[in-house]
């Protein structure tokens, strides 16, 4: 009789995670009598996958009935493949004995598992940055195999080029992870902008996975401040307006100071959004000029998103004769009316004795 050969016809088999794999093995002789065993890996640390004679292998079945007369087909079927099943599988013939003695091994079949990458997760900077600054966005995806993968970055549909990508581990592994960091230069118009991380892999059949991040989470657009005055003839009151424009995010506190003393503090809330995603806010202060002998220095102090306060000051000039006020940044006003002015909010007292 010819010398026994163990034939594993496929050098490699590729299977999608979750599917089943068939690993083929035939022997060329009925001699010697003895079981077939399947191992993953070679050498002393090899892992037993299937033993024809004994053991319980819930995910592994023999393709051919092992009791079939003169059976020489010892192919196996492994169900519900995961990336952890990747490796080289050896079909090994043993001679019956106590213990059984290894006779010959097949050349091995490498099982590679095609596993889809997880949905890319894009994370932005921990702290907000302002226009003209560069911020970094990170995209991560895990659990894919094989290692080859393509990652692209887009900002509002335009592909970005300033990014660095790593696939780990560098060597062989059952599955891989990708991490990419893109650098994005912010502009004041980026509140509604979006960055997209796009991952393409053989398992996705041309339908890439996308992860997104909104630049609104990363950007701070500081406000413009403008303080103006309109006079109100009646009661010698002056209306001073602080216009806070084009800011983002909405978190903003405005404080009015009269001659350095806090007059009123307000928090912005439920503001309408501008087309570009920024906000505007107008606050006004009614100043009773007849209650002042000297000029009044008004300061609009804005603290935006936890940043240092920005001030804009305005002097209301008090003179001997009342005079209609325009939108001048320095206004003169005279009056002798000593009575209180009280607006809708009791906190807003502007009477000085």
């Amino acid at each position: 009789e010819e010398e026994l050969q163990v034939i594993q016809p496929e050098k490699s088999v590729s299977v999608a995670a979750g599917d089943s794999a068939t690993l083929n093995c035939t022997v060329t002789s009925l001699i010697p009598v003895g079981p077939i065993q399947w191992f993953r890996g070679a050498g002393p640390g090899r892992e037993l996958i299937y033993h024809q004679k004994e053991g319980h292998f819930p995910r592994v079945t023999s393709v051919s009935e092992s009791t079939k007369r003169n059976n020489m087909d010892f192919s196996i079927h492994i169900s519900n493949i995961t990336p952890a099943d990747a490796g080289t599988y050896y079909c090994v013939k043993f001679r019956k004995g106590s213990p059984d003695v290894e006779v010959k091994s097949g050349a091995g079949t490498e099982l590679s598992v095609r596993a889809k990458p997880s949905a890319p997760v894009v994370s932005g900077p921990a702290v907000r940055a302002t226009a003209e600054h560069t911020v970094s966005f990170t995209c991560e995806s895990h659990g894919f195999s094989p290692r080859d993968i393509t990652l692209k970055w887009f900002k509002n549909g335009n592909e970005l080029s300033d990014f660095q990508t790593n696939v780990d581990p560098a060597g062989k592994s059952v599955s891989y992870s990708i991490r990419s960091t893109a650098r994005v230069v912010l502009t004041r118009r980026d509140v509604h902008s979006q960055v997209i991380c796009e991952v393409a892999h053989v398992t996705l059949q041309g339908d890439p996975l996308r992860g997104t991040a909104n630049l609104s989470e990363a950007i701070r657009v500081p406000p413009f401040l403008e303080v103006t005055q309109q006079s109100m003839r009646a009661d010698n009151q002056v209306n001073v307006t602080c216009q806070v424009t084009k800011f983002y995010p909405q978190r903003l506190q405005l404080t009015w100071l009269e001659n350095g003393n806090v007059s009123r503090t307000e928090m912005a809330s439920a503001l309408p959004e501008n087309k570009d995603g920024t906000y505007n806010w107008t606050s006004w202060l009614l100043v009773n000029v007849s209650a002042h002998r000297d000029d009044v220095k008004l300061t609009c102090q804005v603290e935006h998103d936890g940043q240092p306060a920005v001030n804009k000051s305005f002097s209301v000039k008090v003179s001997a004769h009342p005079k209609e006020q325009g939108s001048n940044t320095a206004a003169e006003n005279t009056g002798t009316n000593e009575r209180d002015y009280k607006d809708d909010d009791d906190k807003h007292h502007h009477h000085h004795h």
Partner: antibody, heavy 119, light 110 residues
Amino acid sequence: QVQLVQSGAEVKKPGASVKVSCKASGYTFTNYWINWVRQAPGQGLEWIAMIDPSDSETHYNQIFKDRATLTTDTSTSTAYMELRSLRSDDTAVYYCAMDYGSLYAMDYWGRGTLVTVSS
Amino acid sequence: DIVLTQSPDSLAVSLGERATINCRASKSVSSSGYNYIFWYQQKPGQPPKLLIYLASNLDSGVPDRFSGSGSGTDFTLTISSLQAEDVAVYYCQESRELPTFGQGTKLEIK
């Protein structure tokens, strides 16, 4: 290691039935055929039948086809041979044997069960 | 059915001498290049033990003084140098079709 443990000796009256058991261990029961062979006192070996525990496929010696029934219980890895309408010439040691190579041979044997048929 | 005939029915051989037992099949037991003949040894009060499979292959743990040969219809079991523990009855079995046994050969020491 492979072990086949058979049930104890039986004494039966002619016309009765006997059911001999064979409990297998040390291997995957459903992967190998079980044969039944008998040996009358001072006589040679006589093959009765064989069963594949994985699907209960059976092959019988024509001589025993009408009187012998082989069954298995895979939950306990036990094979059974029932012989009906016993006669005095059925007095024999009944062996179960496992076919390791699917060659229809008998690689491992139980120690035998003596069945005595006597009135 | 295939009928196997062993010869001789009994045999006495001196210790250290060669013992030869023959088995003839009523028709060929060869198939696909294999000869479906098996040899068993049975000692008193014990079950048979497989010695040789597929005509010429020594089973695990069997001393190499035992050997098998032959093809087609004629087969031989040889013990090259008889030992005292070899005293037994020897059976051939075929499985080209469903199993059948030869009638057995009793081997004794001369």
